[in-house]
């Protein structure tokens, strides 16, 4: 029976993934009962990705390692719509690391997942980035401009946002 074997495979995958993320929240995508997309609980989902707001305060490097151990990366923001989704889950009095850095301090910004940096899809606060020694990017709230990006020193502990592709089972 096709449906039975599909269910057995799905349960097997769930068991395999459970040691890394003990609880998954899954939805059926489209009309096909075969396609389930999942995010770890309590991650949030938007389009084809899952997001986790890490409230522990860590340096940029440690924040990225924390994400990667979970099978994710610090968030790479590709569109205004994605940023608008993300900020719904952020606190205005906090700052959060993005997966964006300038390791050489030469204003060669690069995303942690090698996505090409596109100047046309950036959301820097006005006047930012403004310091060659500030080589990591955060997203934070300024009352005059709402949410935007700022460059800061990478060693200064911040909260962070992890992102990974949805898990398909």
């Amino acid at each position: 029976n096709f449906m039975y074997s599909k269910t057995v495979k799905r349960l097997s995958k769930l068991r395999e993934y459970q040691q890394y993320h003990p609880s998954l929240t899954c939805v059926m995508e489209g009309k096909d009962i075969e396609d389930w997309s999942c995010c770890p609980t309590p991650w949030t989902s938007f389009q084809s990705s899952c997001y986790f707001i890490s409230t522990g305060m860590q340096s940029w490097t440690k924040s990225q390692k924390n994400c990667s151990v979970m099978g994710a990366d610090l968030v790479v923001i590709n569109t205004r719509e994605e940023q608008d989704f993300i900020i719904q889950n952020l606190k205005r009095n906090s700052s959060y690391f993005l997966g964006l850095s300038d390791p050489g301090g030469r204003r060669h910004w690069q995303w942690v997942d090698q996505t090409p940096y596109n100047e046309n899809v950036t959301f820097w606060h006005s006047g930012e980035p403004n310091n060659l020694d500030e080589r990591c990017a955060i997203i934070n709230f300024r009352s005059s401009e709402e949410w935007g990006w700022n460059d800061i020193h990478c060693h200064v502990p911040q909260k962070s946002i992890c992102k990974m592709k949805k898990i398909y089972i």
Epitope: E16, Y17, S68, G71, D73, V112, D113, Y168
Partner: nanobody, 127 residues
């Protein structure tokens, strides 16, 4: 906790071949994307090759395409880097790295995307 151990490095002549191995322990190897990176003296560590969980997807840096082949054996908890037509500029310490992933087809290329690293094995290519 994942542990990695590279082997197979050595001193060879330009044009020769070497096969590097990476033995993994501590977790289910098939849940991890594997990458090889290298660091030459005085230079930054750079991506060499990566292979997806299933082995079906690979990525290579341009300078090694056609000469190096990455592979893995999930039953043996091991990964490999076959290096042919070696050049003096391939001289470096070679590191294997692992990254948990839930996609069977993704081969990550970013150094910071890999949290688990081996100690490295030295490859020296003389002219």
């Amino acid at each position: 906790q994942v542990q990695l151990q590279e082997s197979g490095g050595g001193l060879v002549q330009a044009g020769d071949s070497l096969r590097l191995s990476c033995a993994a322990s501590g977790d289910t190897f098939s849940m991890y994307t594997m990458g090889w990176f290298r660091q030459a003296p005085g230079k930054e560590r750079e991506f060499v090759a990566a292979i997806s969980r299933s082995g079906g997807s690979t990525n290579y840096r341009d300078s090694v395409k056609g000469r190096f082949t990455i592979s893995r054996d999930n039953d043996l908890n091991a990964g490999y880097l076959q290096m042919n037509s070696l050049k003096p500029e391939d001289t470096a310490v070679y590191y294997c790295a692992l990254r948990l992933t839930f996609s069977t087809t993704t081969a990550y290329t970013g150094e910071l995307q890999y949290p688990y690293w081996g100690q490295g094995t030295q490859v020296t290519v003389s002219s």
